[in-house]
């Protein structure tokens, strides 16, 4: 099983803890990280059959956006 | 765009060692995801772990203890050391690249490890 | 472990046929409203080439014949319309829990 705060959030616990300025939340361990460390979803073109991801969240947008538009990574939460 | 060219592989005793490199070029081993997977002879994709951009291994609990992942990063190239090895290890081993969510979107080309007397 | 399960293990289809390949998983694979459920193709020979990652996200370069849907435990596959160069192997893999799992695959051949 994955160690960090993943092991202890509940199916409906708050979102993860938010990361600084110019670190990005890592989805597969858990935490937070500076971004360059991580590869970023590439855009898509035009006219894909689903919908991007954002590449960044707002400091108002939530995490637990649905799977269509997560909005990931996700830098500088606050 | 990543490529992976993985070598090493070939025909060793029960009981013996290997150890597969797989080159990256096209980004730094000192970003992302970088993953070992096998495939036995007409069967399923096994994952066997990973390395990330901190060093940090995660392994298969059923290979953990014979196999190790490693880099480095000056020669931007990732390593499975086998130990012990076994009849049932015998596969095609790829490493392949994750993406954001780990979906694996780069892959080498294989190297066959062949365990047999 | 999550235990990925995929069915049917193999079917036979026609060029021009709608294909459906099932995976379930032995618990949810979601997370921060994501389901971390990817599907990969594989012809012999050839390393797996990712089709759909996060259930239902086009991989770049894929044909839009493919799709994915689901989200918890059970997701789906989807070709469309099939084309003779899909006849292939199909993996479903999770990568929300340590250790990462694939499915057993599904074989897809010509009838």
């Known amino acids: 099983m994955r160690r960090g705060p993943r092991s202890l959030r509940g199916r409906d616990a708050p979102a993860p803890t938010p990361c600084v300025p110019a670190e990005c939340f890592d989805l597969l361990v858990r935490h937070c990280v500076a971004c360059g460390l991580l590869r970023t979803p590439r855009p898509k073109p035009a006219g894909a059959s689903s919908p991007a991801p954002r590449t960044a969240l707002q400091p108002q947008e939530s995490v637990g956006a649905g799977a269509g538009e997560a909005a990931l990574p996700l830098p500088g939460l606050l | 765009e990543v490529q992976l060219v993985e070598s090493g592989g070939g025909l060793v005793q029960p009981g013996g060692s290997l150890r597969l490199s797989c080159a990256a070029s096209g980004d730094s081993i000192t970003r992302g995801y970088w993953n070992w997977v096998r495939q036995a002879p007409g069967k399923g994709l096994e994952w066997v772990g990973y390395i990330n951009y901190s060093g940090t291994t995660y392994y298969n609990p059923s290979l953990k203890s014979r196999f190790t992942i490693s880099r480095d990063t000056s020669k931007n190239t990732l390593y499975l050391q086998m130990n012990s090895l076994r009849a049932e290890d015998t596969a095609v081993y790829y490493c392949?690249?994750?993406?954001?969510?780990?979906?694996?979107?780069?892959w080498g080309q294989g190297t066959l490890v062949t365990v047999s007397s | 472990d999550i235990q990925m399960t995929q069915s049917p293990s193999s079917l036979s289809a026609s060029v021009g046929d709608r294909v459906t390949i099932t995976c379930r998983a032995s618990?949810?694979?979601?997370?921060?409203?994501?389901?971390?459920m990817h599907w990969y193709q594989q012809k012999p020979g050839k390393a797996p080439k990712l089709l759909i990652y996060r259930a239902s996200d086009l991989e770049s370069g894929v044909p839009s014949r493919f799709s994915g849907s689901g989200s918890g435990t059970d997701f789906t596959l989807t070709i469309s319309s099939l084309q003779p160069e899909d006849f292939a192997t199909y993996y479903c893999?999770?990568?929300?829990?340590?250790?990462?799992?694939f499915g057993q695959g599904t074989k897809v051949e010509i009838k």
């Open positions: 392949a690249n994750s993406n954001f969510y780990g979906a694996m979107d780069y």
């Open positions: 618990e949810s694979v979601d997370d921060y409203g994501i389901s971390f």
């Open positions: 893999q999770q990568t929300s829990k340590d250790p990462w799992t």
